[in-house]
Interface confidence: low
């Protein structure tokens, strides 16, 4: 969570002289309350935009827009504080619109925008617009908040942003998984154009259950340049356990741009009697970068084995 680096932050518009300042998220009207305070914003609109930084990186930003109510309190409006809270970390970033001239009523409703909060993929944010000065203690609140979920890197618009590309979003492994005789799975996927190793995480589940009955991890060494974009085939030996029939195969790459934090791709094989995957399966969660929710594992012995080769 940060501000877009090189942009001159402008909030002036016809009929209003305004400047944007960094804020500590604690306006001094909290400390020195005023008797007369403005009403809250009428509407807040938030959408996702993509902007370029001064280094030429494409980054996702929040476009925040709000309007004023058409009441006399705009005569006491001295500015606004914009606050963005990243919900999972409680990290907060604020800026302050400081009005250098008095607002007057005009023929259109006053409208303000700000598009400089750089956000992360797949994160939820709470955006608050607080009119200034803030109300006295026990006064009517004069802010509005709205939550916004930034799409993950699967989203077409996000896929081309720098944080997503550096996480490996442009790699499409096109995973195929087929069940072979003798309790084996054949996993095939397309290698990326980088000499880096991969890891296949196999988690098996009983029919209609989310407690695993088998787990196996298999390393694939870095391919040679002539193998880039070729298919890699791996045969995994399953545990011979009746009913342990639903298999989630997850491929974790270790690209140089994201190392242990690269996007993973999954494919699932359903139990024979189940035509569709009944529900999403929690991600396997190794130490280096858990990606989503977890579930408990059953007490078991993992004796899986595997072979692999690159297919030209």
């Amino acid at each position: 969570l940060r501000l877009l680096d090189h942009r001159a932050l402008v909030c002036s518009q016809p009929g209003l002289n305004c400047t944007v300042k960094n804020s500590t998220c604690l306006d001094d009207s909290w400390i020195h309350p005023r008797n007369l305070t403005p009403s809250s914003p009428k509407n807040i609109y938030i959408n996702l935009s993509v902007s370029s930084t001064q280094h030429g990186e494409l980054v996702p930003v929040l476009h925040v827009e709000w309007t004023l109510q058409t009441d006399a309190s705009i005569l006491y409006l001295e500015g606004a504080e914009l606050s963005v809270l990243q919900l999972n970390t409680n990290e907060r970033l604020c800026v302050r619109f400081e009005f250098l001239s008095k607002l007057r009523h005009h023929h259109r409703r006053w409208r303000f925008t700000f598009s400089h909060f750089v956000v992360d993929p797949d994160q939820e944010y709470e955006v608050t617009v607080h009119h200034l000065p803030k109300p006295i203690p026990d006064g009517d609140p004069n802010h509005q908040s709205k939550n916004f979920l930034v799409p993950d890197c699967e989203h077409a618009r996000m896929k081309v942003t720098t944080p997503c590309m550096s996480s490996g979003s442009l790699w499409d492994p096109n995973i195929t998984v087929e069940t072979l005789e003798a309790h084996q799975l054949r996993v095939s996927f397309t290698l990326w154009n980088e000499s880096t190793h991969y890891q296949i995480l196999l988690t098996s589940f009983p029919h209609m259950e989310n407690h695993s009955c088998f787990e196996h991890m298999h390393h694939i060494p870095a391919p040679r340049p002539e193998e880039f974009h070729q298919r890699s085939n791996v045969t995994l030996t399953l545990r011979n356990l009746k009913g342990c029939c639903r298999h989630q195969v997850q491929i974790q790459p270790f690209f140089s741009s994201c190392l242990n934090d690269c996007l993973r791709h999954s494919a699932t094989v359903s139990c024979p009697e189940m035509p569709d995957t009944p529900e999403p399966i929690p991600d396997y969660m190794p130490l280096w970068e858990p990606r989503s929710g977890s579930s408990d594992y059953k007490d078991d012995d993992d004796k899986g084995s595997s072979h692999h080769h690159h297919h030209h």
């Epitope: 990243q86 242990n260 280096w288 970068e289 977890s294 078991d300 993992d302």
Partner: antibody, heavy 118, light 107 residues
């Protein structure tokens, strides 16, 4: 050279607070998950907390949940541990440690000592 | 939560002896297990990851084996510089628990 340097340890009274820092250098800090691990005098290693590369996943040991907060500033190549409501049993050497690609923790700091005593 | 136990808690062996330390998980953890060596007054050092993969720079006399719930660290020929405490650690999911440690010294 890949390096982690902890700081911020010291003597604090029970119920007090401390903030530990870990400065990383020699590697792309923003690409790595990080951990805090501690070791009480004469005792074994105890994993304390984990934060993923983009702070999207955070875990704590039950013994510190609700009292300790892990955070990071990728722009400053720094990892933090805010420790509140400290207890005698929090007395330990605190290490920050980087996970290895493939598993385990391959880079450790020298540790910073926290002593909780009245 | 999954518990990690180690045995023995301490051992004394002669230089050149084969030393075996075991680590047991209360539930299956596949091969998501690491072994560390910690010398007195020093920070821990990674020896083995993925249960059996030797960390680069670690002498080949160290080896790891096991999968599921039972794991072994073996020092094929004990050297004076191997005097240390050895810890196993699971890392399949949080909490990333360490075993209680095994102290190794020379007879």
């Amino acid at each position: 050279e890949v390096q982690l340097v902890e700081s911020g340890g010291g003597l604090v009274q029970p119920g007090g607070s401390l903030r530990l820092s870990c400065a990383a250098s020699g590697f792309t800090f923003s690409s790595y998950s990080m951990n805090w691990v501690r070791q009480a005098p004469g005792k074994g290693l105890e994993w304390v907390s984990f934060i993923s590369a983009r702070s999207s996943t955070i875990y704590y040991a039950d013994s510190v949940k609700g009292r300790f907060t892990i955070s990071r500033d990728n722009a400053k190549n720094s990892l933090y541990l805010q420790m509140n409501s400290l207890r005698d049993e929090d007395t330990a050497v605190y290490y920050c440690a980087r996970p290895k690609v493939g598993g385990g923790m391959d880079v450790w700091g020298q540790g910073t000592t926290v002593t909780v005593s009245s | 939560d999954i518990q990690m136990t180690q045995s023995p808690s301490s051992l004394s062996a002669s230089v050149g002896d084969r030393v075996t330390i075991t680590c047991r998980a209360s539930q299956g953890i596949s091969n998501y297990l690491a072994w560390y060596q910690q010398k007195p007054g020093k920070f821990p050092e990674l020896l083995i990851y993925a249960a059996s993969t030797l960390q680069s720079g670690v002498p080949s006399r160290f080896s790891g084996s096991g999968s599921g719930t039972d794991f072994t660290l073996t020092i094929s020929s004990l050297q004076p510089e191997d005097v240390a405490t050895y810890y196993c650690q699971k890392y399949n999911r949080a909490p990333f628990t360490f075993g209680p440690g095994t102290k190794v010294d020379i007879k």
